[in-house]
C-alpha cells in the first residue's frame, strides 16, 4: 500500500483567506448596525433587551489578546449559526410590524449565510479540525405579542452587532500573528 494520505493541503496564503473573511465580517457588521439603527428609529428601545436563546457573548477586552485561531473560528461559526436561526425565525414569526424591515432582513440573512460558508471554507483550508455536526436545536417559540417580536429583534440585532465587532477584532489580531 502507498503512503498514508497526508493532511489536507493548506492554502498557499492563509493571511489572504483570513483577510477575505475579515472583509465579509466587516460588511455584515456595517449592515447589522444600519439595520439596528433603522429598527430603533421605527421602534425605539427602552433599555437593553435580552433573549435567553441567544448565544452568550464571547467577549471581554482581555480575552481578545489570548485568542487562538481554531477557537475563534469554531466559536464564531457556532454563534453565527445561532444568529442565522434567530434571523430566520424573526422573518417568519416576527409579525407584521417587522415586515417594514424587509428586504433588509432578507439581505442580512443571505450575508450571514455567505459568511458561514466562508468560515467553513477557511477552516478546511487551514486544515483545522471540523466541528461535529450541530445537534438539532429546539424550535424557538413564537413571540407572545407584536411588542415581543420587536423586543426580540432588538436583542438579536444588538447581539449580532456585538458578536461581529468581537469577530472583526479577533480575526484582525490573529491575522497579524499568522
Amino acid at each position: 500500500p502507498g503512503p498514508p494520505p497526508g493532511p489536507p493541503r493548506v492554502s498557499p496564503d492563509p493571511r489572504a483567506e483570513l483577510d477575505s473573511t475579515v472583509l465579509l465580517t466587516r460588511s455584515l457588521l456595517a449592515d447589522t448596525r444600519q439595520l439596528a439603527a433603522q429598527l430603533r428609529d421605527k421602534f425605539p428601545a427602552d433599555g437593553d433587551h435580552n433573549l435567553d436563546s441567544l448565544p452568550t457573548l464571547a467577549m471581554s477586552a482581555g480575552a481578545l489578546g489570548a485568542l487562538q485561531l481554531p477557537g475563534v473560528l469554531t466559536r464564531l461559526r457556532a454563534d453565527l449559526l445561532s444568529y442565522l436561526r434567530h434571523v430566520q425565525w424573526l422573518r417568519r414569526a416576527g409579525g407584521s410590524s417587522l415586515k417594514t424591515l424587509e428586504p433588509e432582513l432578507g439581505t442580512l440573512q443571505a450575508r450571514l449565510d455567505r459568511l458561514l460558508r466562508r468560515l467553513q471554507l477557511l477552516m478546511s483550508r487551514l486544515a483545522l479540525p471540523q466541528p461535529p455536526p450541530d445537534p438539532p436545536a429546539p424550535p424557538l417559540a413564537p413571540p407572545s405579542s407584536a411588542w415581543g417580536g420587536i423586543r426580540a429583534a432588538h436583542a438579536i440585532l444588538g447581539g449580532l452587532h456585538l458578536t461581529l465587532d468581537w469577530a472583526v477584532r479577533g480575526l484582525l489580531l490573529l491575522k497579524t500573528r499568522l
Epitope: 472583509l23 456595517a30 448596525r33 471581554s60 465587532d165 477584532r169
Partner: antibody
C-alpha cells in the same frame, strides 16, 4: 447635537504620562467605536487605535503599541487615551473621533487636545 | 501599511471653477462590496470634517458640490463650483486594512 468634547492643552515633562478624556454626547455611546488620531504640527494624520465602548475591545496601530492605552467609562460616556514615556516626538494635537463600526471612517471629531512635551 | 499619495500638494482654483484632488493607494482598497476610501476637509485650528465616505457617499450636511469617485487604487475628490469657504486642506483616508492611513494632504487656495 452630536459632540465629542476634549480637554484643554497639556504641557508635560519628558518621561511623564498624560491621560486625555473625550466625552461623548448626543448619540448612543455604545453604537460607535471611539478612535484616536495624532496630528503633528503641519503634518498629516496618524491613526493610533480604537476602542469599542460596549466591552472595551481595542485595536492599536503597531506604531503606537506600548505608547498609547485606550479605555472607556460607559457610565459617563467618556473615552480616555493615556500616553506614556513622553518625548518631544509625542508633541502633537490628539483627536478622538467617532468611528463607524466595521468601516473605520470618522464622522464626528473631537475638538482636539494639544500635548506639548518640554522640560 | 497602505501608503496614500495625494496630488497635487497644493492648488489654486478660481471661484466657481472645478477643483480636482487625486489620491493613489499603494494597493487596491476596493472589494466586491465597498471601496474603503474616505475624504476629509480641515481648516486651520479645527478638526477634520468628513465629506465623503466609502469612495462616493456624501456625508449628511455636506454640500452637493463635493463628490467622490474611483475604485481600486485611484480616487478623486471633485469640488464644483468652488466657493470661498472651501479654502482648506483635504485628506484622503483608506480603511481597507488596519491601520487606516491618511494621505499627506492637498491645500486648496481660492483665487
Amino acid at each position: 447635537e452630536v459632540q465629542l468634547q476634549q480637554s484643554g492643552p497639556e504641557l508635560v515633562k519628558p518621561g511623564a504620562s498624560v491621560k486625555i478624556p473625550c466625552k461623548a454626547s448626543g448619540y448612543t455611546f455604545t453604537d460607535y467605536n471611539i478612535d484616536w488620531v495624532k496630528q503633528s504640527h503641519g503634518k498629516s494624520l496618524e491613526w493610533i487605535g480604537d476602542i469599542n465602548p460596549n466591552y472595551g475591545g481595542t485595536l492599536y496601530n503597531q506604531k503606537f503599541k506600548g505608547k498609547a492605552t485606550l479605555t472607556v467609562d460607559k457610565s459617563s460616556s467618556t473615552a480616555y487615551m493615556e500616553l506614556r514615556s513622553l518625548t518631544s516626538e509625542d508633541t502633537a494635537v490628539y483627536y478622538c473621533a467617532r468611528g463607524e463600526l466595521g468601516h473605520w471612517y470618522f464622522d464626528v471629531w473631537g475638538t482636539g487636545t494639544t500635548v506639548t512635551v518640554s522640560s | 501599511d497602505i501608503v496614500l499619495t495625494q496630488s497635487p500638494a497644493s492648488l489654486a482654483v478660481s471661484l466657481g471653477q472645478r477643483a480636482t484632488i487625486s489620491c493613489r493607494a499603494s494597493k487596491s482598497v476596493s472589494t466586491s462590496d465597498y471601496s474603503y476610501m474616505h475624504w476629509y476637509q480641515q481648516k486651520p485650528g479645527h478638526p477634520p470634517k468628513l465629506l465623503i465616505y466609502l469612495a462616493s457617499n456624501l456625508e449628511s450636511g455636506v454640500p452637493a458640490r463635493f463628490s467622490g469617485s474611483g475604485s481600486g487604487t485611484d480616487f478623486t475628490l471633485n469640488i464644483h463650483p468652488v466657493e470661498e469657504e472651501d479654502a482648506a486642506t483635504y485628506f484622503c483616508q483608506h480603511s481597507r486594512d488596519l491601520p487606516p492611513t491618511f494621505g499627506g494632504g492637498t491645500k486648496l487656495e481660492i483665487k
